[in-house]
Amino acid sequence: QGGAAEGVQIQIIYFNLETVQVTWNASKYSRTNLTFHYRFNGDEAYDQCTNYLLQEGHTSGCLLDAEQRDDILYFSIRNGTHPVFTASRWMVYYLKPSSPKHVRFSWHQDAVTVTCSDLSYGDLLYEVQYRSPFDTEWQSKQENTCNVTIEGLDAEKCYSFWVRVKAMEDVYGPDTYPSDWSEVTCWQRGEIRDACAETPTPPKPKLSK
């Protein structure tokens, strides 16, 4: 994300096309309050950050409200008046979508349809991961909208589900971040459960007729 300039590494995260976070790691300036200066229009004067992130009492990043969804962030990280890192970046390539909201489950026999509120922008993948205590790893299914149907489930098993949103790489590139996962919810026989047993319960013995 950020090449080194005087040993400065940067990371950019653009939260839900609303807020951009730029953090830096500068070993040479580890005990220095570097300042962050930015603008969204190359013709304007720089503004200084008003919302710094601190680490061990020293500035380590800046949180900014975006002026619009898709824009170039021009920024300069300075030690006093001396720029130690200056760059411009298209912010959308560092998108982190917000976590899915209003997640709902609709059961029909051995299938479940997971829905949530679609985000207001496109080119996203909505991923549902699920597993039962019998599964060694999470299974996954994703769709372009938050309407994901998973078939072939065992009605007798308890399943854990969680959902996240990812930016499509062929649109936003490889430097994006998946959203945080939604809360895990557990379901068995079409009903919500507090949790799924960590160890699978042995099958009930069949009663001889």
Epitope: N41, E67, Q68, R69, D70, D71, I72, A87, S88, W90, V92, Y93, S120, Y121, G122, D123, V171, Y172, G173
Partner: antibody, heavy 117, light 106 residues
Framework: EVQLVESGGGLVQPGRSLRLSCVAS????????MTWVRQAPGKGLEWVAS????????YYPDSVKGRFTISRDHAKSTLYLQMNSLRPEDTATYYC??????????WGQGVMVTVSS | NIQLTQSPSLLSASVGDRVTLSCKGS??????LAWYQQKLGEAPKLLIF???ILQTGIPLRFSGSGSGTDYTLTISSLHCEDLATYYC????????FGPGTKLELK
């Protein structure tokens, strides 16, 4: 499916004006920058103007600055290019494009503008 | 604004050839470079963006590479349908298209 349909081209005399329109569908128009790109007959592509998604900030190359104005109407999902003081060298096919992260991603079929006396 | 030069301006190649097209910027492009393909009478089509990211539906024989001021589009094995004009485009400082490379059959 993204669709961009340009209109308003034609033959115009040097010094006169013309307004191109581009009707967009298949995507949320106000989420995206929009860009006009032109191509003179037998020549390469030239960026003409861009307008940002919400603030409506505009960008132009020196070749059209002060003569061309890009604008958008969110309610109509329509992009415009007002071209004043037209010159013979403005003769080209003009493409309307949906733009994300600085890149024209989806293109219209183009509309021809001929500036000649 | 950054100026782009493309070489060669005309390239003759045979089906099955490995083809390399070059794009050079007058200053650092910071990997903010895209490649377009344009066939006669058609609108340009985005092939690759941010130097090496292939658009959906573009065959894997197309690839991009480069950094700084120098960038390359490679077609690993030329197909008939690849005959077209190829434009590079930078979006690091303003927006500029290169003059194009016309790819024709030898």
């Amino acid at each position: 499916e993204v669709q961009l349909v340009e209109s308003g081209g034609g033959l115009v005399q040097p010094g006169r004006s013309l307004r191109l329109s581009c009707v967009a569908s298949g995507f949320t128009f106000n989420n995206y920058w929009m860009t006009w790109v032109r191509q003179a007959p037998g020549k390469g592509l030239e960026w003409v103007a861009s307008i940002t998604d919400t603030s409506g900030r505009t960008y132009y190359p020196d070749s059209v600055k002060g003569r061309f104005t890009i604008s958008r109407d969110h309610a109509k999902s329509t992009l415009y290019l007002q071209m004043n003081s037209l010159r013979p060298e403005d003769t080209a096919t003009y493409y309307c494009t949906k733009t994300l992260g600085g890149i024209p991603r989806d293109w219209g079929q183009g509309v021809m503008v001929t500036v000649s006396s | 604004n950054i100026q782009l030069t493309q070489s060669p301006s005309l390239l003759s190649a045979s089906v099955g050839d490995r083809v390399t097209l070059s794009c050079k910027g007058s200053q650092n492009i910071n990997n903010y470079l895209a490649w377009y393909q344009q066939k006669l009478g058609e609108a340009p089509k985005l092939l690759i963006f941010k130097t090496n990211i292939l658009q959906t539906g573009i065959p894997l024989r197309f690839s991009g590479s480069g950094s700084g001021t120098d960038y390359t589009l490679t077609i690993s094995s030329l197909h008939c349908e690849d005959l077209a004009t190829y434009y590079c485009y930078q979006f690091n400082n303003g927006f500029t298209f290169g003059p194009g490379t016309k790819l024709e059959l030898k």
